[in-house]
């Protein structure tokens, strides 16, 4: 004559997040008398799933009918899965006992796997801008993805990146994982209008990976460069001076005008040009009153640019008994004068 | 059909012993709890005992002087009486258990019974 | 052990009246009841178990409810072969099973 025997016909059960996980078991007999409870794991920690005669399991069905008669299917559902519902589910017969039941016959037990899709990578940069020629790191993050293998790949203008590194905890058994990766990208005066991508594939995703992004213009600083130019006479005593900013971003820009040393005009950068690359041009213009002035005149464009030290180019005019041709001064050096007289 | 007989049951002294058997067909014997219940005359019922596969439960006005046993090749249940006394007079049914749910038992087939009397 | 009261002991009925018998635990039993009919001469039979689930072959007019501690059998439209003690029985905590001392339906 044969003792009951618990069968679990599934050794392992891979069910996505969020789907229900039906586990089953059976009895060959109805005795000994006892109950049949399911558990996870093994040994004195083992958490109790369902036990049909007391406790609140609210995520567990019975498969069976609870109301038929000499059932011997304990098959179990549990609902809305999570990958902390990943373990070796039991089937357990006990024999009724006084006062305890005592633990007769175990199924061999069945292993839950549970798939779940990675969250949407993040993309962060660095905390501060850079300016063009530096490298800067992004790091990707994304998180609660099962089973472990991922494929992480960088992109930058779709351009596929290869100084990355990418690191996958835990390294061991665990109901979920993270991935965390970090590019170098080297950043180029073009960058304004720039994407890095980083793109998680896993097999919950079906092909269809998921991206995160970062904009290069929320990292990069393009520093601009200044040109200091003397206009035609308006009038018998005032010369016209411009100073062009050009190729600049951000826009967080703010310029001074300094005569002989003393400030003159501050303004903000406001009305400003947008380039096809992103950056920015701007010019100011100063009305300088000769006749004010006895002496040679020193103008200075004074740029301070988001928060970065000031640049500046300066002008300078030579107040003079004899006209000489007018012209302008395009040197590409921070600073520096061109004289120019004026009647 | 599920059929549950008694037998065995007489008249006894106060001390003495008694054998009952239940002749069970029509369902898988070796797989169910089986049990007696007992009904003195003109009283309600009163549980006896149960036998799973070697698993026995016994009230405990019984218990130390009756066991049950069962034989599964010849789908037959026992209860063996001894020390018997008055107040173990009754008919005593033989009871196919049933459960419902994943335990929990109650008793969905009788016997027609076979009293035993106890006196002097 | 559960003790189980039943009442009223007698009940006294015509045929086609509606007939309410009850049950009640000393504790929590959950639904874990069962109801049987006894005629005189006769084993007991299987009527009602997990407290509203009705056997096979009962009629219809048979319905238990009830779950805790409070438990009723209803027979909504007594018939002549429905006379006879009617006994309740929990198997939510044994050893023992116990049954209610019985409510004897009688001819009025």
């Known amino acids: 004559e044969e003792e009951l025997q618990v069968i679990q016909p599934d050794k392992s059960v891979l069910v996505a997040a969020g789907e229900t996980a039906t586990l089953r078991c059976t009895a060959t007999s109805l005795i000994p008398v006892g109950p049949i409870q399911w558990f996870r794991g093994a040994g004195p920690g083992r958490e109790l799933i369902y036990n049909q005669k007391e406790g609140h399991f609210p995520r567990v069905t019975t498969v069976s009918d609870l109301t038929k008669r000499n059932n011997m299917d304990f098959s179990i559902r549990i609902g809305n899965i999570t990958p902390a519902d990943a373990g070796t589910y039991y089937c357990v017969k006990f024999r009724k006992g006084s006062p305890d039941d005592v633990e007769f016959k175990s199924g061999a037990g069945t292993e839950l796997s549970v798939r779940a899709k990675p969250s949407a990578p993040v993309v962060s940069g660095p905390a501060a801008r850079a300016t063009p020629q530096h490298t800067v790191s992004f790091t990707c993050e994304s998180h609660g993805f099962s089973p472990r293998d991922i494929t992480l790949k960088w992109f930058k203008n779709g351009n596929e990146l290869s100084d990355f590194q990418t690191n996958v905890d835990p390294v061991g058994e665990s109901v979920s994982y993270s991935i965390h990766s970090t590019a170098k990208v080297v950043l180029t005066r073009e960058d304004v209008h720039s994407q890095v991508i980083c793109e998680v594939a896993h097999v919950t995703l079906q092909g269809d990976p998921l991206r995160g992004t970062a904009n290069l213009s929320e990292t990069i600083r393009v520093p601009p460069t200044l040109e200091v130019t003397q206009q035609p006479v308006r009038a018998e005593n005032q010369v016209n001076v411009t100073c062009q900013v050009r190729k600049f971003y951000p826009q967080r820009l703010q310029l001074t005008w300094l005569e002989n040393g003393n400030v003159s005009r501050t303004e903000t950068a406001s009305t400003v040009t947008e380039n096809k690359d992103g950056t920015y041009n701007w010019m100011s213009w100063l009305l300088v009153n000769v006749s004010a002035h006895r002496d040679d005149v020193k103008l200075t464009c004074q740029v301070e640019h988001d928060g970065q030290p000031a640049v500046s180019k300066s002008h300078d005019l030579k107040v003079s008994a004899h006209p000489k041709e007018q012209g302008s001064n395009t040197a590409a050096e921070n600073t520096g004068s061109n004289e120019r007289n004026i009647y | 059909e599920v059929q549950l007989v008694e037998s065995g049951g007489g008249v006894v002294q106060p001390g003495g012993s008694l054998r009952l058997s239940c002749a069970a067909s029509?369902?898988?014997?070796?797989?169910?709890?089986v049990s007696w219940v007992r009904q003195a005359p003109g009283k309600g019922l009163e549980w006896v005992s149960t036998?799973?596969?070697?698993?026995?439960y016994y009230a405990d006005s019984v218990k130390g002087r009756f066991t049950i046993s069962r034989d599964n090749s010849k789908n037959t249940l026992y209860l063996q009486m001894n020390s018997l006394r008055a107040e173990d007079t009754a008919v005593y049914y033989c009871?196919?258990?049933?459960?419902?749910?994943?335990?929990?038992?109650?008793?969905?087939?009788w016997g027609q019974g076979t009293l035993v009397t106890v006196s002097s | 052990e559960i003790v189980l009261t039943q009442s009223p002991a007698t009940l006294s009925v015509s045929p086609g009246e509606r007939v309410t018998l009850s049950c009640r635990a000393s504790?929590?039993?959950?639904?874990?009841i069962a109801w049987y009919q006894q005629k005189p001469g006769q084993a007991p039979r299987l009527l009602i178990y997990?407290?509203?689930s009705r056997d096979t072959g009962i009629p219809a007019r048979f319905s238990g409810s009830g779950s805790g501690t409070d438990f009723t059998l209803t027979i909504s439209s007594l018939q002549s072969e429905d006379f006879g003690v009617y006994y309740c029985?929990?198997?939510?905590?044994?050893?023992?099973?116990?049954f209610g001392g019985g409510t004897k339906v009688e001819i009025k």
């Open positions: 029985q929990q198997y939510y905590d044994w050893p023992p099973f116990t």
């Open positions: 036998i799973g596969a070697d698993d026995t």
């Open positions: 029509g369902f898988s014997f070796s797989i169910y709890a």
């Open positions: 009871a196919k258990d049933s459960t419902v749910g994943w335990s929990g038992d109650f008793f969905d087939y």
């Open positions: 504790q929590n039993v959950r639904s874990d």
């Open positions: 997990a407290a509203s």
